[in-house]
């Protein structure tokens, strides 16, 4: 039995930040779980982890180079990514594992979310500014 995961197909990070919501076909309330976010088509790079259990505060881990926070819903984990760089544009996959209570469960691979990080464009100063007011 596998947990199903739904993600937005694409998100655009205009201000170098984005909220990626991972929605599960499973209620995480009072469960021990590990939710993670993986970068790349082969999911090779794990960039954020949220660990939760029934007795402790949510714990969030960010890989060096990523600034991550996490928020828990009954059937979702939202990863808040900040300070993203243009070269971090990629496809990101949500993964979930539930360890307790038994049985151990994990998810079917999701379709992923393309996060497109838009560079910050500062408005250039005009070459020929208008006449200054007295």
């Amino acid at each position: 039995n596998k947990i199903l995961v739904k993600q937005s197909p694409m998100l655009v990070a205009y201000d170098n930040a984005v909220n990626l919501s991972c929605k599960y076909s499973y209620n995480l309330f009072s469960r021990e779980f590990r939710a993670s976010l993986h970068k790349g088509l082969d999911s090779a790079v794990e960039v954020c982890v949220v660990y939760g259990n029934y007795s402790q505060q949510l714990q969030v881990y960010s890989k060096t180079g990523f600034n991550c926070d996490g928020k828990l819903g009954n059937e979702s984990v939202t990863f808040y990514l900040q300070n993203l760089y243009v070269n971090q544009t990629d496809i990101y996959f949500c993964k979930i594992e539930v360890m307790y209570p038994p049985p151990y469960l994990d998810n079917e691979k999701s379709n992923g979310t393309i996060i497109h990080v838009k560079g910050k464009h500062l408005c250039p100063s005009p070459l020929f500014p208008g006449p200054s007011k007295p």
């Epitope: 021990e32 590990r34 993670s36 794990e46 982890v49 660990y51 714990q59 881990y61 890989k63 060096t64 594992e97 360890m99 307790y100 994990d106």
Partner: nanobody, 124 residues
Framework: EVQLVESGGGEVQTGGSLRLSCAAS????????MGWFRQAPGKEREFVAA????????DYAESVKGRFTISRDNAKNTVYLQMNSLRAEDTAVYYC?????????????????WGQGTLVTVKP
């Protein structure tokens, strides 16, 4: 809950070798990392080396690179630290740590569980 038990510490001459082991038990996920930190008397606990479950990510403190090697046996849930060319400044209590992060984290705050520590003494 994760339990960690270290072994392998002891006294050795400068230039000698030791191998530390750390066995983890409890509920494990498909990826996590374990690391070694050390604490000399009167000093902060500092990062030594770490490795993740998939064994595709390892990291070392600059001071031990080329001398220490971290490895793990996933079947035994055990991580090892092979320490060669030991120096007097390597004398410390070595602690094994466990983190739910899936990479070889050097950040002490990322580690959720710690072993009791094993003393390594390097004699001149």
């Amino acid at each position: 809950e994760v339990q960690l038990v270290e072994s392998g510490g002891g006294e050795v001459q400068t230039g000698g070798s030791l191998r530390l082991s750390c066995a983890a038990s409890g509920r494990m996920f498909s990826n996590y990392a374990m690391g070694w930190f050390r604490q000399a008397p009167g000093k902060e606990r500092e990062f030594v080396a770490a490795i993740n479950y998939r064994r595709d990510d390892a990291d070392y403190a600059e001071s031990v690179k080329g001398r220490f090697t971290i490895s793990r046996d996933n079947a035994k849930n055990t991580v090892y630290l092979q320490m060669n060319s030991l120096r007097a400044e390597d004398t410390a209590v070595y602690y094994c740590g466990f983190t739910y992060a899936g990479w070889a984290s050097s950040r002490r705050d990322d580690y959720n569980y710690w072993g009791q520590g094993t003393l390594v003494t390097v004699k001149p």
